[in-house]
Interface confidence: low
């Protein structure tokens, strides 16, 4: 009689994570008597997946009634497949004895697991940067299989080309991780901009995953200052305004100096927002010129978002105004919206 053969008809099987995998195995003879066992891997480190004779294998069920005496189909189904289940599975016939001895093995079925990548996480630089500077964004996604994956970067819908991507590990693994770094040049209009990392994988069925980062968390747009003298509001009073334009983020502190001496400090609160997301703010100072014998140097000094202060000065001519002897400087400083 022809010697028993163990037939595993499928060289490979591919299953999505969470599904069940059916691994086929038939034998060509009922002789010799003895159980079938399934293993993952070969050699001394192989892992027992199912033993027909004994043991508890909660995720494994037999496809046919393997307990029947004449049964020759020893196919199994493994439920709730995860990437950790990937590998080559062998159906092995044992000869009954004390102990049972291995008689013949099938050729093996390679189980590959299709696992979806995790949602891409995009992170930007730790510190803010100003327009014209280049900043780096990273994108990470994990846990996918097979290894083939496509990653693209976009800024406001425009695809970026300056990026570098690695998929790890380089060798065989049950699942993989992708890491990409893109370089983005900031512009003054980027407060409302978004950087998008898009990951496409066979498991996503054409619907890529996206991770985003808002450039509002990365950009700092420094303000421009303009100090102007307004017409006299009342006798001996001059209104000087400091217009702070096009800044982001809102965190800003303004100090008025008269001839180098601090007159008043205030924090930008009620600001107006421009269409590009930057802010404008205006502060004014009422100067009592009768309190000054000489010309006054007024300085508007602005500290924006913790950066070194910038300032703009204005020389106020007081010679044309009458002077009251002995009077003190009276200055009023108020913030207001610039409409």
């Amino acid at each position: 009689e022809e010697e028993l053969q163990v037939i595993q008809p499928d060289k490979s099987v591919s299953v999505a994570a969470g599904e069940s995998a059916i691994l086929h195995c038939t034998v060509t003879s009922l002789i010799p008597v003895g159980p079938i066992q399934w293993f993952r891997g070969a050699g001394p480190a192989r892992e027992l997946i199912y033993n027909q004779k004994e043991g508890h294998f909660p995720r494994v069920t037999t496809v046919s009634e393997s307990t029947k005496r004449e049964n020759m189909d020893f196919s199994i189904s493994i439920s709730n497949i995860t990437p950790a289940d990937a590998g080559t599975y062998y159906c092995v016939k044992f000869r009954k004895g004390s102990p049972d001895t291995e008689f013949k093995s099938g050729a093996g079925t390679e189980l590959s697991v299709r696992a979806k990548p995790s949602a891409p996480v995009v992170s930007g630089p730790a510190a803010r940067a100003t327009p014209q500077h280049t900043v780096s964004f990273t994108c990470e996604s994990h846990g996918f299989s097979p290894r083939d994956i496509t990653l693209k970067w976009f800024k406001n819908g425009n695809e970026l080309s300056d990026f570098q991507t690695n998929v790890d590990p380089v060798g065989e693994s049950v699942s993989y991780s992708i890491h990409s770094t893109a370089k983005v040049v900031l512009t003054r209009e980027d407060v409302h901009s978004q950087v998008i990392c898009e990951v496409a994988h066979v498991t996503l069925q054409g619907d890529p995953l996206r991770g985003t980062a808002n450039l509002s968390e990365t950009i700092r747009v420094p303000p421009t200052l303009e100090v102007t003298q307004q017409p006299v509001r009342a006798e001996n009073q001059v209104n000087v305004t400091c217009q702070v334009r096009k800044f982001y983020p809102q965190r800003l502190q303004l100090t008025w100096l008269e001839n180098g001496n601090v007159s008043r400090t205030e924090t930008a609160s009620t600001v107006t927002e421009n269409k590009d997301g930057t802010y404008n703010w205006m502060s004014w100072l009422l100067v009592n010129v009768s309190a000054h014998r000489d010309d006054v140097k007024l300085t508007c000094q602005v500290e924006h978002d913790g950066q070194p202060a910038v300032s703009k000065s204005h020389d106020l001519k007081v010679s044309a105004h009458p002077k009251e002897q002995g009077s003190n400087t009276a200055a009023e400083n108020t913030g207001s919206n610039e409409r």
Epitope: P83, A84, G143, N166, S173, H179
Partner: antibody, heavy 121, light 107 residues
Framework: EVQMLESGGGLVQPGGSLRLSCAAS????????MSWVRQAPGKGLEWVSA????????HYADSVKGRFTISRDNSKNTLYLQMNSLRAEDTAVYYC??????????????WGQGTTVTVSS | EIVMTQSPATLSVSPGERATLSCRAS??????LAWYQQKSGQAPRLLIY???TRATGIPARFSGSGSGTEFTLTISSLQSEDFAGYYC?????????FGQGTKLEIK
């Protein structure tokens, strides 16, 4: 055979410096992120520092930041840890370990046998 | 930094029995968690990564589960060589941090 061998440990006074080395063999060194992990006598494991496969990215534990510097020479298959301003609490066995990829994902699956650093006056 | 807390500090189990070790993160680390085994006088050995994936050459009796902040390492039937120290480590946020360890001893 994959191997990593640390060296450079020894006895040093507080405030002193040491440079640890880890020579790797049996694998493509530049393809793997590397790390230093330490273990004080009778204590648990403490992650110290990590460096990406290319060397472009480094990270440190708060306890060593500003004092220790991790670096690598991929042409020599060697990882380094420059330790300055050493303190008594830096006394430990220092292990070098390799991550499973060029970035720091998965675990550290290859370890050296460790080198002992003792900081004492 | 993320604080990893392991419990119990010491676990006494008889050979052949099941051992369950716990690890809790002070904030979510997703599934970015590894388990290591360390025998006295030896370097650590990676057992599990990705919370549940066995590393190369690790026997099937070791299994990991959990995600977010709660994780478990289970050794289904303890062998004599399994009595050692076990550490969890998160690699979701820098700095990467280990738990303080669980010592598994023979009952």
């Amino acid at each position: 055979e994959v191997q990593m061998l640390e060296s450079g440990g020894g006895l040093v006074q507080p405030g002193g410096s040491l440079r640890l080395s880890c020579a790797a063999s049996g694998f493509t060194f530049s393809s793997y992120a590397m790390s230093w992990v330490r273990q004080a006598p009778g204590k648990g494991l403490e992650w110290v520092s990590a460096i990406s496969g290319s060397g472009s990215s480094t990270h440190y534990a708060d306890s060593v930041k500003g004092r220790f510097t991790i670096s690598r020479d991929n042409s020599k298959n060697t990882l380094y840890l420059q330790m300055n301003s050493l303190r008594a609490e830096d006394t430990a066995v220092y292990y070098c370990a390799a991550y499973s990829g060029s970035y720091y994902y998965y675990g550290m699956d290859v370890w050296g046998q460790g080198t002992t650093v003792t900081v004492s006056s | 930094e993320i604080v990893m807390t392991q419990s119990p500090a010491t676990l006494s189990v008889s050979p052949g029995e099941r051992a369950t070790l716990s690890c809790r993160a002070s904030q979510s680390v997703s599934r970015n968690l590894a388990w290591y085994q360390q025998k006295s006088g030896q370097a650590p050995r990676l057992l599990i990564y990705g919370a549940s994936t066995r590393a190369t050459g690790i026997p099937a009796r070791f299994s990991g589960s959990g995600s977010g902040t709660e994780f478990t390492l289970t050794i289904s039937s303890l062998q004599s060589e399994d009595f050692a120290g076990y550490y969890c480590q998160q690699y979701n946020n820098w700095p990467y941090t280990f738990g303080q360890g669980t010592k598994l001893e023979i009952k």
